[in-house]
Interface confidence: medium
Amino acid sequence: DTEIKVNPPQDFEIVDPGYLGYLYLQWQPPLSLDHFKECTVEYELKYRNIGSETWKTIITKNLHYKDGFDLNKGIEAKIHTLLPWQCTNGSEVQSSWAETTYWISPQGIPETKVQDMDCVYYNWQYLLCSWKPGIGVLLDTNYNLFYWYEGLDHALQCVDYIKADGQNIGCRFPYLEASDYKDFYICVNGSSENKPIRSSYFTFQLQNIVKPLPPVYLTFTRESSCEIKLKWSIPLGPIPARCFDYEIEIREDDTTLVTATVENETYTLKTTNETRQLCFVVRSKVNIYCSDDGIWSEWSDKQCWEGEDLSKKTLLR
């Protein structure tokens, strides 16, 4: 479109600061920018994990960018220089691409890495991760877990391992201050005298793996001759009421099973005077207003009514 030319950025590289997947992409300005002293050049950066179908694209005036990646796979990135239109009379001037890649050289065969990694953030308070040892690894193999999230100066190692047969098979995390609503990075690596062990990397956000406690204080209140209100209280802990969804299971006279999902701590049930027995249980889950995903709590203790008391105003266990 134009004779004006601009070089790509120099020294484009991906730097691993040791944060288990949170990487720095950095570069230097292109050579020969003297003609464009009055211009702030921009850079279009594209990057992805190798094998991903989609690139992430950003445009920045800075000489660095940070983002999270899956270190189980390689990373590829490319960048080019853009001259603002103001500097080129509206012509579109961009450099060729500078490209770079990064990957961690894998040690050991894939089967040696931990299997069935499972992390649960109990009641939005206690994080616990568990795993199974790799396939065919010997008992001398031990696994170590490291974690990092934005706010920590460096990656930390688990200090409270769960063990089985002398092997680490899980980690109880300490209190994790200001750790939700941001990427939480984990690496589980291992050592064995006999063979190298493959590392595994995991990334999630804590609010999406919360398993709350079950609801408590289940009660019945007769609203009218044909309506009974079921009520319960939110479980103890830091999760606010606005963050819960509930699932109710109701059994009437050992025959009818009603299940319902509700957002409040009440449910009104249509019933008849012939009802002899009514039981219900409730479980809770963090809702879409507070997380993208979650784990259902265990069911609450069962609350039942039997006999004539159902016609009375309030029924408590």
Epitope: E44, T54, T57, I59, P84, W85, E92, Q94
Partner: antibody, heavy 119, light 107 residues
Framework: QVQLVQSGAEVAKPGASVKVSCKAS????????TQWIRQAPGQGLEGIGA????????SYNQKFKGRATLTADKSTSTVYMQLSSLRSEDTAVYYC????????????WGQGTLVTVSS | DIQMTQSPSSLSTSVGDRVTITCKAS??????VAWYQQKPGKSPKLLIY???YRYTGVPSRFSGSGSGTDFTLTISSLQPEDFATYSC?????????FGQGTKLEIK
């Protein structure tokens, strides 16, 4: 000079899909983003998404994610926009346009393709 | 997405008049605003980019100003060929979003 030539008008039934093409010439096809923008009768312009033919990178307006699919054929310097599950509100003129990047205005536009959704 | 609100939606005016069209962004977009002219049955034509820079070949009677959230397109002396619809666009963040357009009609 830069030219974007789009395919002809289309009539489609609700629930069907339509594929509009945009053939580029006069520049290095793989080095620039091609945007798709639509304009319903009497309405303003609305961005659908963009594709970078150099590596098939795409960027979709959230409103059209899952319904619009952008593809590029390097051998013919043509970009395609397919819109599925059509409804009457999708009746519009669909434009392809070229900017240097995702965040540049569009000095070059196709002539537009009228898509009419009607049962 | 950033909303672009344009006013007025239509304007009856005469050749030789000075015309001002405004565009308000729902959040700060620095100076990343473009203006387009569109005539019936035709594609939009880029007039102004980066709030105040005239695109190649655009007559000097067209000028743009503003930064942050408030932007203005001014036509200093309206010519017969300027009767058209004018739209603003933010090119600050993805997806690009446009104003609803201002139609200039002959009084």
């Amino acid at each position: 000079q830069v030219q974007l030539v789009q395919s002809g008008a289309e009539v489609a039934k609700p629930g069907a899909s339509v594929k509009v093409s945009c053939k580029a010439s006069g520049y290095t096809f793989t080095s620039y983003w091609t945007q798709w923008i639509r304009q319903a009768p009497g309405q303003g312009l609305e961005g659908i998404g963009a594709i970078y033919p150099g590596d098939d990178d795409t960027s979709y307006n959230q409103k059209f994610k899952g319904r619009a699919t952008l593809t590029a054929d390097k051998s013919t310097s043509t970009v395609y926009m397919q819109l599925s599950s059509l409804r009457s509100e999708d009746t519009a003129v669909y434009y392809c346009a070229r900017g240097a990047t995702l965040l540049r205005p569009f000095p070059y536009w196709g002539q537009g393709t009228l898509v009419t959704v009607s049962s | 997405d950033i909303q672009m609100t344009q006013s007025p939606s239509s304007l009856s005016t005469s050749v030789g008049d000075r015309v001002t069209i405004t565009c308000k962004a729902s959040q700060d977009v620095s100076t990343a605003v473009a203006w387009y002219q569109q005539k019936p049955g035709k594609s939009p034509k880029l007039l102004i980019y980066s709030a105040s820079y005239r695109y190649t070949g655009v007559p000097s009677r067209f000028s743009g100003s503003g930064s942050g959230t408030d932007f203005t397109l001014t036509i200093s002396s309206l010519q017969p060929e300027d009767f058209a619809t004018y739209s603003c666009q933010q090119h600050y963040s993805i997806p690009p979003t446009f104003g609803q357009g201002t139609k200039l009609e002959i009084k």
